[in-house]
Interface confidence: low
């Protein structure tokens, strides 16, 4: 790695997987084992993430970008860039401090993680329950009754949504 | 990441469908939103859409928008486009904390 | 409807020094902490600081607080830096699949 030639910051020119060595008189040097510097002109390298435990590790570190980590089986991440591993539930149930418990009646959870939700009120807009909720499915809602005089061309509901595949925040 | 298309320049009343399309990760895992942002103004939430396709919209947005998925998109139809709907769209993901947003999309609603 | 305040519009502080900004919600929020706060630059997407009320987004510094519970929330920035300067908006979640995003407050920093 040559010396820099910036007659303003000596560092700028430093690329990415390399930090501006002080102690060697500015030189660029390599990021050292487990860093890595994103952006160039940086005077140190970060300290890659590491994923131990329930993390596993979904992309490596380099030089130039930071190790991602997702969640082992039977958990799932949260927060941005998964700082924390949850555990799943079933659809239909929640995470409490208890461990997973099933919605209460009214509510639903088609995911693996969240929180159970209340149906939707279909009344709130005026149409009738076209399908009824469970705890793992919202309510689908219809036309309004007074769509449905006899005579009426029936409606056919939807079919049952697959499972959701799952790895989410 | 997450990257929304289709806006442009369109006239008052000409439906018009944004997507969203991710890089990264998988679509069909997520719950999705839709929230825009007129010129110099604050966000306004439009609607989000199940990781099983149930679609539910802010009071304000229901008839005005639709929000659909494919396995590997989200859409939003903008149903009959007013003036009052110029904005930058967003898509973003997560139900209780949107972690990603994509970059945004203009959406310009002019006679 | 439900209605998120933002009571200031703007606030200011040094470098160093601490805002906090305030949101009360007209309803309860969902389960008391389905709050969530983000940081928007201009030109920019919104970046997520907070979820659960008070939970840290990965990546954001710990001098980001979120507080509160039920209708009264409040984001705390500490150790105020330049690049701090930006507009926050919270954003509630309720019954129903509903969201609404406060009016925003910008923060300024001297």
């Known amino acids: 790695f040559e010396r820099t030639r910036s007659l303003q910051d000596p560092c700028s020119n430093c690329p990415a997987g390399t930090f501006c060595d002080n102690n060697r008189n500015q030189i660029c040097s390599p990021c050292p084992p487990n860093s890595f510097s994103s952006a160039g002109g940086q005077r140190t390298c970060d300290i890659c993430r590491q994923c131990k435990g329930v993390f596993r590790t979904r992309k490596e570190c380099s030089s130039t970008s930071n190790a991602e980590c997702d969640c082992t089986p039977g958990f799932h991440c949260l927060g941005a860039g998964c700082s924390m591993c949850e555990q799943d539930c079933k659809q239909g149930q929640e995470l409490t401090k208890k461990g997973c418990k099933d919605c209460c009646f009214g509510t639903f959870n088609d995911q693996k993680r969240g929180i159970c939700r209340p149906w939707t009120n279909c009344s709130l807009d005026g149409k009738s329950v076209l399908v009824n909720g469970t705890k793992e499915r919202d309510v689908v809602c219809g036309p309004s009754p007074a769509d449905l005089s006899p005579g009426a061309s029936s409606v056919t509901p939807p079919a049952p949504a697959r499972e959701p595949g799952h790895s989410p925040q | 990441s997450l990257e929304e298309s289709g806006g442009r320049l369109v006239t008052p009343g000409t439906p018009l469908t944004l997507t969203c399309t991710a890089s990264g990760f998988s679509l069909s895992n997520y719950y999705m939103n839709w929230v825009r942002q007129a010129p110099g103004k604050g966000l306004e939430y439009i609607g989000i859409i199940s990781s099983s396709g149930s679609a539910y919209y802010a009071s304000w947005a229901k008839g005005r928008f639709t929000i659909s998925r494919t396995s590997t998109t989200v859409d939003l139809r903008i149903t009959s486009p007013t003036t009052e709907d110029t904005a930058t769209y967003f898509c973003?993901?997560?139900?209780?904390?949107?972690?990603?947003w994509g970059q945004g999309t203009l959406v310009t609603v002019s006679s | 409807a439900q209605v998120l305040t933002q009571t200031a519009s703007s606030v200011s502080a040094p470098v160093g020094g601490t805002v906090t900004i305030s949101c009360q919600s007209s309803q309860t929020v969902y389960n008391n902490n389905l709050l969530s706060w983000y940081q928007q630059k201009p030109g920019q997407r919104p970046k997520l600081l907070i979820y659960y009320a008070s939970t840290l987004a990965f990546g954001v510094p710990s001098r980001f607080k979120g507080s509160g519970s039920g209708t009264e929330f409040t984001l705390t920035i500490s150790d105020l830096e330049c690049d701090d300067a930006a507009t926050y908006f919270c954003?509630?979640?309720?019954?129903?699949?509903?969201?609404?995003f406060g009016g925003g407050t910008e923060v300024e920093v001297k």
């Open positions: 954003q509630g979640g309720y019954s129903g699949w509903i969201y609404v």
């Open positions: 973003a993901r997560g139900d209780y904390g949107m972690d990603l």
